[in-house]
């Protein structure tokens, strides 16, 4: 008799834990920026504070009739999904509602900004426990709305936003496109992307993960004990806000970076049929459905990493793409990907005290993506070692020469424009353990880290025959930190990480002219953190 | 996202014919004007004036007041609807789009964004 969405996101072992804490004495507070809500509804009565905040535009149309239950519908349902007594994810969590959407579900960027500022003021006046802000709304890309989210996130507030219901790239909408926000797409009971009329859930690199968002049973503002089903990325975001509230009630000191990494790490992987998304967005969209993670006490000092894609560089000859990790995360490796295969590689550089992953387009290329591998490595000390391109025919070697530093990633950047004259770089674990090896005209960058108990190894997999991609996975207990393609043919599209899988992509035309001796190799650097051990390279 | 995707950024740094005042002429606008790429979602006439990050509280108020004063000289009435202090320095203003060039030349202004709609999802 449990609704499908709760069954999906709350594993069986959590159900009993929840039963032991009926009204939770959690200090977590969720702020909901939405429509007005029906506070007397049994699902939320006693746990919701309806603030006096109200910043909404006038309703359209002269004949618009303001009916309370309709005005409250969206917000009441979401409040119920977050903390409802019977159909809520974080039953008993206290919730504060701010009205930024009118009776037609419309608001403004300025009204939302004033709402976010209201939360910041409340935080300054009366500091409390962890705060979660749910933004079940979307507008066009807004630099200032994203900036406001960034500022609020840096004060320790966790923001969760709807990806948007436009069946479009979430990066074109705000606050979904703000990197500091946890952006949530919607899936149905079959774990497939939600279709809403002719539209549906947004997708792309700005989505962090998906959550149930179709036919979600929740509080209906029609009456104080009524329920109804609603669909959308708002509902999906409300699930994740509820999960985050539960994580924080167990462990109030979890940071945004830790929360995001744990949400990603413990989500259900590879159940979404990616064919629903446009072809160019499939590689950028995470195949992740949220579930409530176990506590850190149960899972120990696991090395957690996520893949962050840059925006597309654009096709100009010198176009670069930049991918950034969150301030708390370590950039352990950088790779690049181009659909045309025309790219001049990737490298790591420091910008404003933060290391970023950069990729460069090549002449005639349609553009590149930079792909950063961002990890949580407690007490890490990481540095980049690079060697300029060697003279023709010579190899370039880079290794981690500092004591107790291990290789977590390699990057290669070619000085030459002409793709035909260069031999691509290589990484060879058997001959040079812990080294990045580049060939003619390649600058080589090694990402080297020292952290208590950090150990790494290279794992390779090569395919000689025709294949569009070569993959290699890190074993259980190991985390993928670096991913490179070691080509046998002249043209590769690049490499990227999907969860713990290193994917090396090969150009279609390269498959046809490949001889059997030229294997394309996917090379993964797999690391693990064993706090008792000292940093080491595993051969 | 770091890059401003499907987003309109317009440079409105052209000197106005009436900008004869020394303090105005001295300041060349480097600020940009931004608005939503979806025309139907735009709210022309309401603008969020975003100031440089390190702008002090008093300077925010002075900038808003300066805009009102200069607009009045040109026969425009503008209304400051809200001043942002806590999340970012800036203010929300209701004014004619004719004044955007003038506003972009104010000291401390980083960019101006036209207000736009957001929707329940």
């Amino acid at each position: 008799s449990i609704p499908w969405n709760l069954e999906r996101i709350i594993p069986a072992w959590h159900q009993t834990e929840e039963d032991r804490s009926p009204d939770g004495s959690s200090q977590v507070e969720v702020y909901l920026l939405d429509t007005s809500i029906q506070g007397a509804h049994r699902e939320i009565e006693g746990r919701v504070t309806i603030t006096d905040f109200n910043s909404v535009p006038e309703e359209d149309g002269t004949r618009f009739h303001r009916q309370a239950s309709k005005c409250d519908s969206h917000g009441t349902h979401l409040a119920g999904v977050v903390s409802g007594r019977d159909a809520g994810v974080a039953k008993g969590t206290s919730l504060h509602s701010l009205r930024v959407l009118n009776c037609q579900g419309k608001g403004t960027v300025s009204g939302t900004l004033i709402g976010l500022e209201f939360i910041r003021k409340s935080q300054l006046i009366q500091p409390s426990g962890p705060l979660v802000v749910l933004l079940p709304l979307a507008g066009g890309y807004s630099r200032i709305l994203n900036a406001a989210c960034r500022h609020l996130a840096r004060t320790g507030v966790v923001l969760v936003a709807a990806a948007g219901n436009f069946r479009d790239d979430a990066c074109l909408y705000s606050p979904a496109s703000a990197p500091e926000v946890i952006t949530v797409g919607a899936t149905n009971a079959q774990d497939q992307p939600v279709t809403l009329g002719t539209l549906g859930t947004n997708f792309g690199r700005c989505v962090d993960l998906f959550a149930p968002g179709k036919d979600i049973i929740g509080a209906s503002s029609d009456c104080s004990t009524c329920f109804m089903s609603q669909s959308g990325t708002s509902q999906a975001a409300a699930h994740v806000a509820g999960i985050v509230a539960r994580m924080l009630s167990r462990e109030p000191t979890l940071t945004l970076a830790e929360l995001r990494q744990r949400l990603i790490h413990f989500s259900t992987k590879d159940v979404i049929n990616m064919a629903w998304f446009p072809e160019d967005q499939q590689v950028l969209t995470p195949n992740l459905v949220a579930t409530l993670p176990p506590s850190t006490h149960e899972t120990g000092g696991q090395l957690l990493c996520r893949t962050v894609w840059s925006a597309h560089s654009g096709p100009t000859r010198t176009a670069t793409a930049t991918a950034r990790c969150a301030p708390e995360e370590e950039l352990l490796s950088c790779s690049s990907f181009s659909r045309s295969g025309r790219r001049r590689g990737d490298w790591i550089e420091a910008i404003g005290g933060q290391q970023v992953c950069k990729a460069l387009n090549a002449f005639g290329g349609e553009g590149v993506y930079a792909v950063a591998r961002c990890c949580l490595v407690p007490r890490a000390n990481c540095s980049i070692h690079n060697t300029p391109a060697a003279r023709a025919g010579l190899e370039t070697h880079v290794h981690c020469h500092q004591k107790d530093h291990v290789l977590t990633g390699c990057s290669f950047h070619w000085e030459v424009e002409d793709l035909s004259v260069r031999r691509q770089p290589a990484l060879r674990s058997r001959r040079q353990p812990g080294q990045c090896v580049g060939h003619q005209a390649a600058s080589v960058y090694a990402s080297c880290c020292h952290a208590p108990g950090l150990e790494c190894k290279i794992k390779e997999h090569g395919i000689s025959g025709p294949s569009e991609q070569v993959t290699v996975a890190c074993e259980a207990g190991w985390t993928l930190t670096g991913c490179n393609v070691l080509p046998g043919a002249s043209l590769t599209l690049g490499a990227y990480s999907v969860d713990n899988l290193c994917v090396a992509r090969v150009h279609d035309t390269a498959r046809a002219d490949r001889t059997s001796g030229e294997a394309t190799v996917a090379a993964a650097i797999c690391c693990r953190s064993r706090p008792s051990a000292k940093a080491s390279w595993v051969q | 996202q770091d890059e401003d995707g499907d987003y309109e950024e317009l440079m409105l740094a052209l000197p106005s014919q009436e900008d004869g005042l020394a303090d105005e002429a001295a300041h060349v606008a480097t600020a940009t004007f931004r608005r939503c790429s979806k025309e139907a979602w735009r709210l022309p006439g309401t603008y969020i004036v975003v100031l440089m990050e390190e702008t002090q509280r008093l300077q925010i108020e002075q900038t808003a007041h300066r805009l009102q004063t200069r607009a009045a000289r040109r026969g425009y009435v503008i209304k400051v609807l809200h001043i942002f202090y806590d999340l970012f320095p800036g203010f929300l203003v209701k004014m004619s789009s004719d004044l955007l060039g003038l506003a972009l030349k104010l000291p401390h202004v980083e960019y101006i964004e036209e207000d736009s709609f957001v929707f329940a999802q």
């Epitope: 009926p22 007594r85 039953k91 008993g92 104080s224 004990t225 329920f227 | -």
Partner: antibody, heavy 126, light 106 residues
Framework: QLQLQESGPGLVKPSETLSLTCTVS??????????WTWIRQPPGKGLEWIGS???????YYNPSLKSRVTISVDTSKNQFSLKLSSVTAADTAVYYC??????????????????WGQGTLVTVSS | EIVLTQSPATLSLSPGERATLSCRAS??????LAWYQQKPGQAPRLLIY???NRATGIPARFSGSGSGTDFTLTISSLEPEDFAVYYC????????FGGGTKVEIK
Amino acid sequence: QLQLQESGPGLVKPSETLSLTCTVSGGSIGSSSYYWTWIRQPPGKGLEWIGSINYRGSTYYNPSLKSRVTISVDTSKNQFSLKLSSVTAADTAVYYCARENSGVVPAAGPNWFDPWGQGTLVTVSS
Amino acid sequence: EIVLTQSPATLSLSPGERATLSCRASQSVSSYLAWYQQKPGQAPRLLIYDASNRATGIPARFSGSGSGTDFTLTISSLEPEDFAVYYCQQRRNWFTFGGGTKVEIK
């Protein structure tokens, strides 16, 4: 079929706490589909809802009585209880317990009070 | 709170006659209204829910109608066992009951 039975003292002194228990038979109080409710009826008057509780112990009270009411549940005994503090003569009534569908699972039946216990009269008097 | 006013307070009719009971809400309760029957010394019994749906085991002579603020319970032909007190109840906002209508034998 499901039956509910109220029990507790029939006489309570003013300013003391009224305590009643409702025992559920023919079904489990641990079902997530229902709320368990207390309703009262002063002699010769109408009905007044007091409050409700679900199997997890999550409560929902009449705002006018909230400060004095505590409802609790014991799933192991298949019982739920009412405590009403600082009673006065105005609290003299027949107290009923009843079941109500939570509404989350529509198949569980109408979202109303059905069935009811037969009621127990509690008199507040010194 | 939403106040429900029932009328008449007492309805004196003979068996076989048609009974029409009214319940008026102080504000709209949509269709979130139920009717209960209570016989002396017994607990109330659910007759009609959501304004017009008969509860399980309730004879077809009982019917409910109305929405918003005005509701009616109709007993098409009174049987001897129908003489009792009838209460309406809303769940639009919290739970409140009407004062009751007593249907007595004329």
